[in-house]
Structure formats: structure tokens, C-alpha cells
Amino acid sequence: GIAIPRNSGCPNSEDKNFPRTVMVNLNIHNRNTSTNPKRSSDYYNRSTSPWNLHRNEDPERYPSVIWEAKCRHLGCVKADGNVDYHMNSVPIQQEILVLRREPRHCPNSFRLEKILVSVGCTCVTPIVHHVA
Amino acid sequence: GIAIPRNSGCPNSEDKNFPRTVMVNLNIHNRNTSTNPKRSSDYYNRSTSPWNLHRNEDPERYPSVIWEAKCRHLGCVKADGNVDYHMNSVPIQQEILVLRREPRHCPNSFRLEKILVSVGCTCVTPIVHHVA
């Protein structure tokens, strides 16, 4: 059935589009109250599973620029600076929402899209498969 | 100035709103071709900086459910299972886009919002401040 707006001040929606196409205000509200909430800009170097950041730009996407993590080593860095290959550096991935211009190049029409991004790396104990 | 649509098939936009309010198709396109793209569902247990996942639900937000990581220890887990407090477990955080219903309770009107989420944890060497 067609949803009944719960608030009389809501924008109207045509039945054929509803609820697939919505109006979105791009004036981003930032919920991060702290002035410097992340404090993680140097973790990529200090981690036992360090990573490099790669720039991915797509003007048809919002956000256009995403920095992706790529683990530097297969193993993990020990206290002496050497790599321990008995452990594994693995990417921590997250599915995020982005807006994709649709039709292409349109400044004011988008479609929601889910993409998988690597945010950083962590050091894990490998899964050992024992052969009988 | 008012942007000229780059594609004659673009929806119109009123000057007063443009380019802040846009049309978004909520029919999500998933760019992740793999059936199990994350492959990181057990990293939270196997990591030397393990984390727990906490469910955060907000019906006024899209997506309404977000899982947040909380590091289990201040230190990092050694091979023998004990915690090494000379190292630090730290959250890897990422700013992500969500849609916030605006006005509240409206089914088809949203505002973009940036929120900071903890995706997982990594083990880092601490910054030591030497006192003169």
C-alpha cells in the first residue's frame, strides 16, 4: 500500500515514484561534535598491520573522492620492525552508502549505491587448515 | 550561477533549492559483485586487537541499523593469549553518509548527514611523550 505521510508538513510524493524517489538535502549535517574526532590519521603508519592510502575519484559519485586502504604486508610488523609471516595483515572492509549521478552528469539526480571500501588493516591469527 | 544540466534528460531543479536539494532513487544498486564480499566477519575475534560489535538503531535514519566496533582491550593480544599493554588497540574510524528524515517522521524527505563510525580495531605502537 501507499504510505500515508506521518507529518502534514512533509513534501508530497507521487504514487508512481513513492517511496522509491525521495528529496534529499545535500547540505550535509555533521554529527561529529568533537573538533577533532578521528585522531586516526597516523594509525596507518603506527599499526602492526600498516596500510597505504589510495585515492579513488569518481565525479559521478557523491562523495567523489574516497581514500582506500591497502595493507602493506602479508604479515604483521613485529616490535623489531621485521615482518612476522605467521600472522596476517587483513583489510577491514565496510559497506557504505554513496550517491551515484543518474542519469550520468546530472547535477541534481542521484541513485543510492552500496560500495565496499577498505578502511584500514588489522593483524589476525591465520586460519590453519590441517590435512588429515 | 545556476548550473546548466549536463544531460538534457536531467530532472529540473528550482533555482531557490539548487543545488542543495536533489532527487534520490532509493532503489539501492549494489556494486559488490561477490556474494560474500566482506569475508571479515570473523576478524573481530581473530585480530590481535579484537572488538565487539554493538547495534545502533535509529528509525529516523537510513540505514536505520549500523553496527559499531568497540575494542575489547586497551592493549593488544599476544600469541599466548595474554594482553600486551605496551601496545594499544585503537578503533579505525570512518566518516560515512546516512540519510536523516527531515522533517522528522517524513517518509520521503531526507537530509544527508555525516556520522563517524568505528569499523574495527588495529594494534598500534603507542606515542611515548618523554618528560624533560
Epitope: 550535509i28 590519521s41 592510502l53 575519484e57 565525479p59 557523491y62 567523489s64 573522492v65 574516497i66 581514500w67 | -
Partner: antibody, heavy 121, light 107 residues
Amino acid sequence: EVQLVQSGAEVKKPGSSVKVSCKASGYTFTDYEIHWVRQAPGQGLEWMGVNDPESGGTFYNQKFDGRVTLTADESTSTAYMELSSLRSEDTAVYYCTRYSKWDSFDGMDYWGQGTTVTVSS
Amino acid sequence: DIQMTQSPSSLSASVGDRVTITCRASSGIISYIDWFQQKPGKAPKRLIYATFDLASGVPSRFSGSGSGTDYTLTISSLQPEDFATYYCRQVGSYPETFGQGTKLEIK
């Protein structure tokens, strides 16, 4: 008001290094990357690289062969460009410019005033 | 690297003239281009972004068009303050490259 204010002119010897600063104000520093562009006397514009103050990510024009280092200090909203092993052909005006991570359509909308670097023995 | 070739490299025109500057990419894998105006001793100023769109505060006599490898900046009626050097910049392929510039002089 958005402003990018760069450090003053520098005169350097060949083989030395120079570090140019770019102090941002009037916007959220971490929402924008800082790109660096240079212009030799009477020449065109040359893109040098980009730094993301939020993640610490950097990407360089390989033409500079590892001589460029871009950094940022989030606490002071200041970006830095260091160029090492200077040679006479590095004599140029160096510009910083902000670039929105959210919308490429808002790229390079504000520029610093430029810093003249002269390399001479 | 993608080369951006601007033509002409310089041109003379009079106030009121219609002027067109073109920018050609060495390959077609760019996403869009920006146009900048630069006056002597000043930083570049963005005129057109995303190939077509007028930057804030830029007069409507400036317009941009193009796709693929060929792009154009048009000034419909030259004004005295428009005499400057113009640069295109490609976005979408690293490194982001600028054209060599077109110097617009008073005839």
C-alpha cells in the same frame, strides 16, 4: 570567508629543500583535500600532488620522482609542501588549492596567493 | 599522462567579440574539464567546472561545452576585464593535467 594563506617567498640553494605552508580558514579543513600546483616563470600550471588532511593520504605526480612530501596539521588547519633536492628549474610560484572530497564539481574553487621559490646558487 | 592541448596558444580580439578557446585531450578517458582564468601576478580563478557549469560569481557571458576529447570555452561578448590567460584542466585521469594556456590579448 574561505581563505588559504601561504608562507612568504623563499630563496634557496641548489640541492637544498624548501617547505611552504598553506593555512586554511573559513571551512572544515578535513572536508577538503589540499592540492598543490606550481607555475614556472612564463609557463603554464603543473599539478604536483594532493594531501587528504583527514586520512593522511597523499598522491603525487610521479614527475617529481619522490622529491615532494605533502603533509597537514589538522590542529592548526595548515597544509605543507616540501620539495627536496632543489634545482634551478624548480624556480616557480607554488599554489595550494582546496578540493572537495564530497563533490568533484567543487574542485579547486579557492586558491592561496602563491609562494615564490627561487633556486639560485 | 593525458596531454591537454589548447588552441590557439594566443589570440587577439576586441571588446564585444565572441571568442572560443578549445582544449583537446590526448585520449578520451577523462571525466570532465574545468576552465581557469589567470591574470598576471594572481592565482588562477575557476570559471567553469564539470565542463558546463558556471562557478559562483562568474558572468554568464562565459560558457563551457564538449565531451570525449574536445572541449570549448566561449566568451559571448568580450569585456575589458576578460583579457587574461585561460587554462583547461582534465579530471578523471592521473596526474590531473592542465592545458598549456591561451593568452587573450586586446587587438
